[in-house]
């Protein structure tokens, strides 16, 4: 059967298309091409007589068509109007006619798009921005790219106008990015240049650094203030409520106790019209900036449970310090049997119980610094326990609480030779 194949089917304006004829019959007199789905003399493009090899243009001939001896038709410099159907009319030597129709679609070669914006300086959490991909092109698909990636899913992003317009509601600083649009049709794809969205924001609450509060007399006080802001914030400093200077850094050499007080950093963004402040307390004191490592002294380190008491003393040569105690990573005192005295220097446990066995340490600190002692181990022994409270694990004797104590006493080895000998005597 006579058929027409369009190569290609989707043709770009300005390019060419070949209407390729398949299964052309033998013994032909000639053939004619027509624009449309039927033979119509008024729409004849070109006729060809095989015997004379003569091509004759018809009313629909534009000078862009070339007919080949195999009846295929080449159309050059395609225009939008060329879209549609084409009919080949074959006249055989026996004057019997045969027809076939083919078609193709014409699309414009897309121009490079550009992005227009309705707001070049949007303010964070306040403004919306609408980007539009120009120009509007029929039969084109519009795509958007943010930092060269496809659009993220967000309730603040909305596509409209056939995806030609991208709207960002309540812009945030995170929307500051590179935006591109792309136009696509079956014959071409073009991407715009980047448009950088510049979201105005801030200032955020300023941060004053360094974070130190305490300084020694004679030191230099150097404070820096920073607040995230676009455009960058303007800074000013106040000390105890009195304006000092309009700079991001504040420097006071050789400070004295008189420089103690509240230091305020004020950050202002003149474009967004917003301002924020942060207040920092500075204390100038003679207190030692380095606290020495304390030591623990114990009245005894091995005691008998429910009988003995013990005193632990945290020794330090520093003055103006505070002391706190720790046992098994918890601060003390943790029971009524524990008492702190002499400004927390001494920890007394009276009487000592089996649960008091373990590691103790103290920490000395002042507002500027702190230091910890090495730990000390307190061992707690018990006399004459009943046989059923002993268990043998790898030939080591451990105490197992009875009458109300459900858990094995935490890996606290009992130095109890008499009970051990008694245990082995019975096994």
């Amino acid at each position: 059967k006579l058929t027409i194949e369009s190569t290609p089917f989707n043709v770009a304006e300005g390019k060419e298309v070949l209407l390729l004829v398949h299964n052309l019959p033998q013994h032909l007199f000639g053939y004619s091409w027509y624009k449309g789905e039927r033979v119509d003399g008024n729409r004849q493009i070109i006729g060809y007589v095989i015997g004379t090899q003569q091509a004759t243009p018809g009313p629909a001939y534009s000078g862009r068509e070339i007919i080949y001896p195999n009846a295929s038709l080449l159309i050059q410099n395609i225009i939008q109007n060329d879209t549609g159907f084409y009919t080949l009319h074959v006249i055989k030597s026996d004057l019997v006619n045969e027809e076939a129709t083919g078609q193709f679609r014409v699309y414009p070669e897309l121009p490079k798009p550009s992005i227009s914006s309705n707001n070049s300086k949007p303010v964070e959490d306040k403004d919306a921005v609408a980007f539009t991909c120009e120009p509007e092109t029929q039969d084109a698909t519009y795509l958007w790219w943010v930092n060269n990636q496809s659009l993220p899913v967000s309730p603040r992003l909305q596509l409209s106008n056939g995806n030609r317009t991208l709207t960002l509601f309540n812009v945030t600083r995170n929307d500051s990015a590179s935006y591109k649009c792309e136009t696509q049709n079956p014959v071409s794809a073009r991407r715009s240049d980047s448009v950088i969205l510049n979201v105005l924001y801030g200032p955020d609450t300023p941060t004053i650094s360094p974070s130190d509060t305490y300084y020694r007399p004679g030191a230099n006080l150097s404070l820096s203030c920073y607040a995230a802001s676009n455009p960058p914030a303007q800074y000013s400093w106040l000390i105890n409520g009195t304006f000092q200077q309009s700079t991001q850094e504040l420097f006071i050499p050789n400070i004295t106790v008189n420089n103690s007080g509240s230091y305020t950093c004020h950050a202002n963004n003149s474009v967004t019209g917003c301002n924020r402040t942060t207040v920092k307390t500075i204390i100038v004191t003679e207190l030692s900036p380095v606290v020495a490592k304390p030591q623990i002294k114990a009245s005894k380190t091995t005691v008998t449970g429910d009988k003995d008491s013990v005193n632990l003393t945290c020794s330090t040569n520093d003055t103006g310090i505070s002391i706190r105690w720790f046992f098994k990573n918890q601060s003390l005192p943790s029971s009524e049997r524990m008492k702190l005295s002499q400004g927390n220097i001494t920890l007394s446990i009276n009487p000592v119980k089996r649960e008091d066995a373990g590691t103790y340490w103290c920490e000395v600190f002042n507002p500027i610094s702190k230091n910890q002692s090495d730990p000390i181990m307190l061992n707690v022994n018990y006399n004459a326990l009943p046989q059923e409270n002993l268990i043998n694990v790898d030939e080591q004797l451990y105490f197992q609480g009875g009458s109300g104590l459900n858990d094995i006493f935490e890996a606290q080895k009992i130095e109890w030779h008499e009970a051990r000998a008694h245990h082995h005597h019975h096994h």
């Epitope: 300005g14 060419e16 070949l18 070109i46 060809y48 091509a55 004759t56 243009p57 001939y61 534009s62 000078g63 862009r64 070339i66 007919i67 080949y68 080449l74 050059q76 410099n77 225009i79």
Partner: nanobody, 119 residues
């Protein structure tokens, strides 16, 4: 009605020059490709040169490269062939034709103009 009318042929001595013109009607030459085809007795038909105004492209047969120049004036809907350094083997009837930019195939031409190169 589509028409191609050639002019400018004549007798010229070897080494001489001629300029052929092809006036087109019934279509715009800016939309298509126009070529010059020559036929000489006992020789194969030859596509000498063509021009596609819409593409801004030109092509030449090896035998005329550097000697012939094809051009088009779309405002006059006319194509030209400037022939320099003519040789005896350039003697032929020159036809203006509508040609394919793809493969140089042509299938509609004018009545032709005769160029004779002889001393």
């Amino acid at each position: 009605e589509v028409q191609l009318v050639e002019s400018g042929g004549g007798l010229v001595q070897p080494g001489g020059s001629l300029r052929l013109s092809c006036a087109a009607s019934g279509f715009n030459i800016k939309d298509t490709c126009i070529g010059w085809v020559r036929r000489a007795p006992g020789k194969e038909e030859e596509l000498v040169a063509d021009i596609c105004p819409y593409k801004g492209s030109t092509r030449y047969a090896d035998s005329v490269k550097g000697r012939f120049t094809i051009s088009a004036d779309t405002s006059k809907n006319t194509a030209y062939l400037q022939m320099n350094s003519l040789r005896a083997e350039d003697t032929a009837v020159y036809y203006c034709a509508i040609v394919s930019a793809r493969d140089g195939y042509y299938n509609y031409w004018g009545q032709g103009t005769t160029v004779t190169v002889s001393s």
